[in-house]
């Protein structure tokens, strides 16, 4: 009951340290609650970036104090990452939870990786 | 939102008894399978056992069987592991896990752990 969870595989934040991407998922069954996760992996550590439950059709929810936002069509979701600094750079995962109805299924993408540059600071123009 | 909250951790002797517990929240807990797992120091993640969401159907890594008792309580939306003649050898950080057994690894939905420290 393996879940193919696809992601691009390298992406390069913009000046404004926003980065997106789509996660697209194969799903097994039909299913009505999909939960969405961004994970980020250093070496064998893995903390939660953001989470968003949804229904199909609807509007993927981050919490309010997210730095997440997305949306989704269809087995794909469009994850947009924001106030990046040069120090997030690093392997971002796609996890895709189907969460009802049962069984549960979980897959996990390969990961991609953002790279953020810091803007260099305007001169002063006397 | 998701969430799991293990607790019931502690400093135990060998051959002493401890209660996990694991409340979840954020999700319909009785249509889930639920995992416990454990990391113990240094080691990697270690599958302990598995119940089915009406818990009647158990699953059990060997080094545990007949010390370790999984179970639930749906109407509270928790999970348990009674630990029994506890081994030294069991001193972990304890994880409750959604999923079944295939899905326990470090992308698991899962807590932040309870720490068992079995020593004399």
């Known amino acids: 009951k393996a879940m193919h969870v696809a992601q691009p595989a390298v992406v390069l934040a913009n000046s404004r340290g926003t980065a997106s991407f789509v996660c697209e998922y194969a799903s097994p069954g039909k299913a009505t609650e999909v939960r969405v996760t961004v994970l980020r992996q250093a070496d064998s550590q893995v903390t939660e970036v953001c989470a968003a439950t949804y229904m199909m059709g609807n509007e993927l929810t981050f919490l309010d104090d997210s730095i997440c936002t997305g949306t989704s069509s269809g087995n794909q979701v469009n994850l947009t990452i924001q106030g990046l600094r040069a120090m997030d750079t690093g392997l971002y995962i796609c996890k895709v939870e189907l969460m009802y109805p049962p069984p549960y299924y979980m897959g996990i993408g390969n990961g991609t990786q953002i790279y953020v540059i810091d803007p260099e600071p305007c001169p002063d123009s006397d | 939102e998701v969430q799991l909250v293990e607790s019931g951790g502690g400093l135990v002797q060998p051959g002493g008894s401890l209660r996990l517990s694991c409340a979840v929240s954020g999700l319909n807990f009785g249509i889930y399978d639920f995992t416990w797992g454990r990391q113990a120091p240094g080691k990697g993640l270690e599958w302990i056992a598995t119940?089915?969401?009406?818990?009647?159907?158990?699953n059990y890594v060997d080094s545990v069987k007949g010390r370790f008792t999984i179970s639930r309580d749906n109407a509270n939306e928790s999970l348990y592991l009674q630990m029994n003649s506890l081994k030294p050898e069991d001193t972990a950080l304890y994880y409750c896990?959604?999923?079944?057994?295939?899905?326990?690894?470090?992308?698991?939905?899962r807590g932040q752990g309870t720490l068992v420290t079995v020593s004399s």
């Open positions: 119940m089915n969401p009406d818990g009647d159907i158990t």
């Open positions: 896990a959604l999923g079944p057994e295939r899905y326990f690894s470090i992308y698991a939905t």
